[in-house]
């Protein structure tokens, strides 16, 4: 969470952003809120990106003003126009690219004053892993697959029964580049699996951490997946 305040001139207003991460090829949200104003026509929202010459997005007098927008953001940005009046300046970014990562500034002008706050936006690829029993293998084997990750993650196996055990010598992980030549498919195989145990395949990079669990008993197989974004802290 980053809270910024206005500077000289008019009164300052509080602007708040939250660090976030975008999944390449999907839509993302850059969060920004501010002290609301009663008149929409008095609110100006400017989104800027460090290292980029043009604006990311501008909203003023109740509508988008995109004459100064940099072409790398052309047709890919939108604010939630109906929520600006209640202090939501968040930006929707369509078709997130790797190069959208960076430091953004949410700059607000209202009749009460000015304010801005920075936001660190990370981009990459992350997806839920699925763990299955590999019946094709010669011994009891688990196969953990996740279709899209970037940057290259680490993969660690754990088990409920053998807590703290190091499975690196009985597992094998590979990374296969996807067709767009950026993201990769993650495949990790765990050998010598015992029955009546719960195994976890944990995939992590600096953007996200995902876990795929599988519980193997004589009577059933239960699966569960979880993904958590690792937001960078305020600085």
């Amino acid at each position: 969470l980053i809270i910024g305040f206005g500077i000289s001139g008019r009164h300052s207003i509080t602007v708040t952003t939250v660090a976030s991460a975008g999944n390449i090829g999907e839509d993302g949200i850059l969060s920004c809120t501010f002290e609301p104003d009663i008149k929409l026509s008095d609110i100006v929202i400017q989104w800027l990106k460090e290292g980029v010459l043009g604006l990311v997005h501008e909203f003023k007098e109740g509508k988008d003003e995109l004459s100064e927008q940099d072409e790398m953001f052309r047709g890919r940005t939108a604010v939630f126009a109906d929520q600006v009046i209640v202090g939501n300046a968040s930006l929707r970014l369509k078709n997130v690219q790797l190069t959208d990562a960076g430091t953004y500034k949410c700059y607000i002008i209202t009749s009460k004053g000015k304010g801005n706050a920075n936001l660190e936006y990370k981009t990459g690829a992350f997806s839920m892993p699925e763990v299955n029993v590999d019946y094709n293998a010669s011994s009891e084997t688990l196969r953990c697959e996740a279709p899209r990750w970037f940057p290259q993650p680490t993969v660690v196996w754990a088990s409920q029964v053998d807590q703290g055990a190091n499975f690196s010598e009985v597992s094998n992980t590979s990374f296969e580049l996807n067709s767009e030549n950026v993201t990769m498919k993650v495949v990790s195989v765990l050998y010598n699996v015992t029955i009546n145990n719960t195994y976890s395949c944990m995939i992590e990079n600096d953007i996200a951490k995902a876990t795929g669990d599988i519980k193997v008993t004589e009577s059933e197989i239960k699966r569960r997946s979880h993904l958590q974004l690792l937001n960078s802290k305020a600085s």
């Epitope: 980029v52 072409e71 790398m72 052309r74 960076g102 950026v182």
Partner: antibody, heavy 126, light 113 residues
Framework: QVQLQESGPGLVKPSETLSLTCTVS??????????WGWIRQPPGKGLEWIGT???????YYNPSLKSRVTISVDTSKSQLSLKLNSVTAADTAVYYC??????????????????WGQGTLVTVSS | DIVMTQSPDSLAVSLGERATINCKSS????????????LAWYQQKPGQPPKLLIY???TRESGVPDRFSGSGSGTDFTLTISSLQAEDVAVYYC?????????FGQGTKVEIK
């Protein structure tokens, strides 16, 4: 304050490979907001863009040099490097590394150079 | 490639007087969809690397004195130093960033008369 420092041999023989390194300090080369580039300036002449790289490794080269040039990045050392092979006397120049503040025109990443290294003179001679 | 041609090649101006440098591009660097001119100006003092002065043809880089100004559109651009100071002695380059490869003018040397 971002600082860039070029290093490498000052003398290269014709037909050999010119290799230079640029070390970035006061800011991370893996900053996702910036691109990095190489520009050269023959003695007493103007500036020529060689190429540009993003921290992920994406490269953009001047078509006139593309067949001979390789730019790479080592984010762990905060360095970018330039290799120019089959050099001739015409490659004698001061070589600069610089940070690129970008824009996009019709799908092409391009921009202005806002921070420069001091430059290193490379002479091609036997 | 877009060819950038500067004039004059050198210029001698008295201290406190106005210096004007011209830059012409072989094709327009004005992008009609956003009405921006993709042109920058740099200053290079002897033994130093170039320093960014102006981008978008007329936007001054942070920290650049306001005696430096840029103007023009399309193919014809001008860098003006309104009141020449001793520290302004340098070679000045224009650069287009409208199309790849980015290209520079041949430079204009500014001296004190």
């Amino acid at each position: 304050q971002v600082q860039l420092q070029e290093s490498g041999p000052g003398l290269v023989k014709p037909s050999e490979t010119l290799s230079l390194t640029c070390t970035v300090s006061g800011g991370s080369i893996s900053s996702s907001s910036y691109y990095w580039g190489w520009i050269r300036q023959p003695p007493g002449k103007g500036l020529e863009w060689i190429g540009t790289i993003y921290f992920s490794g994406n490269t953009y080269y001047n078509p006139s040099l593309k067949s001979r040039v390789t730019i790479s990045v080592d984010t762990s050392k905060s360095q970018l490097s330039l290799k120019l092979n089959s050099v001739t006397a015409a490659d004698t120049a001061v070589y600069y590394c610089a940070r690129l503040r970008v824009t996009m025109v019709r799908g092409v990443i391009i921009g202005v150079f806002d921070y420069w290294g001091q430059g290193t003179l490379v002479t091609v001679s036997s | 490639d877009i060819v950038m041609t500067q004039s004059p090649d050198s210029l001698a101006v008295s201290l406190g007087e106005r210096a004007t440098i011209n830059c012409k591009s072989s094709q327009s660097v004005l992008y009609s969809s956003n009405n921006k001119n993709y042109l920058a100006w740099y200053q290079q003092k002897p033994g130093q690397p170039p320093k960014l002065l102006i981008y978008w043809a007329s936007t001054r880089e942070s920290g650049v004195p306001d005696r430096f100004s840029g103007s023009g559109s399309g193919t014809d651009f001008t860098l003006t130093i309104s009141s020449l100071q001793a520290e302004d002695v340098a070679v000045y380059y224009c650069q287009q960033y409208y199309s790849t490869p980015p290209t520079f003018g041949q430079g204009t040397k500014v001296e004190i008369k």
